[in-house]
């Protein structure tokens, strides 16, 4: 899978994580920080 950094317009896309652009899948993906989940790492869990 080809990946790259997200475009600058997606800077705020991932609330608590790193935004990765999955080129072959034509979509952005959030790699969440520890303790966070959700498509955009918007949910905190203990």
């Amino acid at each position: 899978v080809s990946i790259t950094k997200c475009n600058s317009d997606m800077n705020g896309y991932c609330l608590h994580g790193q935004c990765i652009y999955l080129v072959d899948m034509s979509q952005n993906y959030c790699r969440c920080e520890v303790g966070y989940t959700g498509v955009r790492c918007e949910h905190f869990y203990l």
């Epitope: 475009n7 317009d9 896309y13 034509s26 979509q27 498509v39 955009r40 918007e42």
Partner: antibody, heavy 116, light 106 residues
Framework: QDQLVQSGAEVKKPGASVKVSCKAS????????IQWVRQAPGQGLEWMGR????????KYREKFEGRVTITADTSTNTAYMELSSLRSEDTAVYYC?????????WGQGTLVTVSS | DIQMTQSPSSLSASVGDRVTITCKAS??????IAWYQQKPGQAPRLLIQ???TLQPGVPSRFSGSGSGTDYTFTISSLQPEDIATYYC????????FGGGTKVEIK
């Protein structure tokens, strides 16, 4: 199956406002950005602006600043684009476009005609 | 706002010809360019994103290349069904479409 279903065609008088809706199904708009693009008859594609429904952040193209308002209602999974002070040059097909989780998934378009 | 200058605005070519369209950005867009095909009365169809990544179901005669500010879209062998208007779109910083290129058969 993911869908963006837009409201029906509108005819408006110059100076009036129009509000076009874009209802998402099959996905949560909070996971995406919703962009708005228009195309006047026989003309090219023109990006108008976008909203991040989760944060409520909006960005508009400079030429529409002050005349366009993009909103989202996450409870109904619907985005809206309101354009005010309509003039004949605003006659166009208006499209909502999903981006973020999937690159550029388009609604079917809404024709807005501005005529006196 | 980033400006996208697309050329030519129209072209006429024969079936089987190689067709090339260019888009120049007013600043580096880091390969974040997409190409759309639009036929009359239809919504635009995404052909290519991230400069050169073909979408599923798009024929391999379509291709894209470029970096920095200069990008190219190519149809290696023009087919009758390719008659349409083609648009580039930068999506690095917000979004800007090129002016479009109308492709006709000679």
């Amino acid at each position: 199956q993911d869908q963006l279903v837009q409201s029906g065609a509108e005819v408006k008088k110059p100076g009036a406002s129009v509000k076009v809706s874009c209802k998402a199904s099959g996905f949560n708009i909070k996971d995406t950005y919703i962009q708005w693009v228009r195309q006047a008859p026989g003309q090219g594609l023109e990006w108008m602006g976008r909203i991040d429904p989760l944060r409520g952040n909006r960005k508009y193209r400079e030429k529409f600043e002050g005349r366009v308002t993009i909103t989202a209602d996450t409870s109904t999974n619907t985005a809206y684009m309101e354009l005010s002070s309509l003039r004949s040059e605003d006659t166009a097909v208006y499209y909502c476009v999903r981006s973020g989780t999937l690159f550029d998934f388009w609604g079917q378009g809404t024709l807005v005609t501005v005529s006196s | 706002d980033i400006q996208m200058t697309q050329s030519p605005s129209s072209l006429s070519a024969s079936v089987g010809d190689r067709v090339t369209i260019t888009c120049k950005a007013s600043q580096d867009i880091h390969k974040y360019i997409a190409w759309y095909q639009q036929k009359p009365g239809q919504a635009p169809r995404l052909l290519i994103q991230y400069t050169s990544t073909l979408q599923p179901g798009v024929p391999s005669r379509f291709s894209g290349s470029g970096s920095g500010t200069d990008y190219t879209f190519t149809i290696s062998s023009l087919q009758p069904e390719d008659i349409a208007t083609y648009y580039c779109l930068q999506y690095d910083n917000l979004r800007t479409f090129g002016g479009g290129t109308k492709v006709e058969i000679k």
